[in-house]
């Protein structure tokens, strides 16, 4: 679950930068892509690639966006209005109690049991002992949340909770 | 696990203000970032977005029931609420709440849905 | 409004078949769009975000594609827990609309 939002993960813009488009809030939010400014009267864009807005708002700041780890790969990439998506590379997944980086998947059972289940993002290969059927790593849950590496961002299964 | 809960009556008479809540349990309705939503499903048909609250109270609805609508947070208690005023049969339905992801890409988490009948 | 086409309305197939459904949008979503698995009486559950990013902890016979106007959710193998509803949602631009739903049934 993400944290609460803190300064460090908002953008703040530089009030004079002249490339921020400024428009006029509607009803005292302004649109996706944008953030208001702190006297409530312009809605100033947010910066491709650097932060971003999702809903119609009234954020002081754009939220930052996410960049992705070594050993991720980039599957959407950070635009004004969506948070990167960033997912482990093929061969290697990310655990919910090792969520700190993408480890390697195994490359096959050990003896005496069989792969039921491919490596994901998400897990490792799935092993089952032939004769009981009994599981050799714990379920992947039903759901879960995209994961993003920074807080109160959703990123890919790396680091979005999607 | 975020798990998302609505309740309140399930019928309603015409001309009645609708009113639901929903509870959010598994973590934190002020959390950065999420906005939280009222959809609907009519009988045998397809959903409807009806509107969204952040944390803050800022609140933003669809526009075919924006006259008609409010949303409200309370996060000491973890909850948010719909009413829908001046309600007829066509406002028969079953509400849902949901959590937008915080990146901007949809609902990750839904409630099991509550129908609400209005008849007199 | 941004309209969503979800077709077909229902479909009949059998466990192990490769099931394809698609949504088309009345303008172009970038790849803002999801799509969703709802049974009977339980919440609605993320399968695809981003057009084609896989929910965590959904299998892997699930996938989206498509970008634009026309997106499609394939489930390579169907098995029997499958058999119900998918509908997609476009989170494009305000008001969020949604696919009218496919019933998956067994032939």
């Known amino acids: 679950e993400s944290a609460l939002i803190t300064q460090q993960d908002l953008a703040p813009q530089q009030r004079a930068a002249p490339q921020q488009k400024r428009s006029s809030p509607s009803e005292g939010l302004c649109p996706p892509g944008h953030h208001i400014s702190e006297d409530g009267r312009d809605c100033i864009s947010c910066k491709y690639g650097q932060d971003y807005s999702t809903h119609w708002n009234d954020l002081l700041f754009c939220l930052r966006c996410t960049r992705c780890d070594s050993g991720e790969v980039e599957l959407s990439p950070c635009t004004t209005t969506r948070n990167t998506v960033c997912q482990c590379e093929e061969g290697t997944f990310r655990e919910e109690d090792s969520p700190e980086m993408c480890r390697k998947c195994r490359t096959g059972c050990p003896r005496g049991m069989v792969k039921v289940g491919d490596c994901t993002p998400w897990s490792d290969i799935e092993c089952v002992h032939k004769e009981s059927g009994t599981k050799h790593s714990g379920e992947v849950p039903a759901v879960e949340e995209t994961v993003t590496s920074s807080p109160g961002t959703p990123a890919s299964p790396c680091s979005l909770s999607g | 696990q975020v798990q998302l809960q609505e309740s309140g009556p399930g019928l309603v008479k015409p001309s009645q203000t609708l009113s639901l809540t929903c509870t959010v349990s598994?973590?934190?309705?002020?959390?950065?970032?999420?906005?939280w939503s009222w959809i609907r499903q009519h009988p045998g048909k397809g959903l409807e977005w009806i509107g969204y609250i952040y944390y803050s109270g800022s609140a933003y609805y669809n526009p075919s029931l924006k006259s008609r609508v409010t949303i409200s947070v309370d996060t000491s208690k973890n909850q948010f609420s719909l009413k829908l005023s001046s309600v007829t049969a066509a406002d028969t339905a079953v509400y849902y709440c949901a959590r937008d992801d915080s990146s901007g890409w949809g609902f990750d988490y839904w409630g099991q849905g509550i129908l609400v009948t209005v008849s007199s | 409004d941004i309209q969503m086409t979800q077709s077909p309305s229902s479909l009949s197939a059998s466990v192990g078949d490769r099931v394809t459904i698609t949504c088309r949008a009345s303008q172009g979503l970038r790849n803002d769009l999801g799509w969703f698995q709802q049974k009977p009486g339980k919440a609605p559950k993320r399968l695809i975000y981003?057009?084609?990013s896989l929910q965590r902890g959904v299998p892997s016979r699930f996938s989206g594609s498509g970008s634009g106007t026309e997106f499609t959710l394939t489930i390579s193998s169907l098995q029997p827990e499958d058999f119900t509803t998918y509908f997609c949602l476009q989170h494009n631009s305000f008001p969020w609309t949604f696919g009218q739903g496919t019933k998956v049934e067994i032939k």
């Open positions: 598994g973590g934190s309705i002020s959390s950065g970032g999420h906005y």
């Open positions: 981003a057009a084609s």
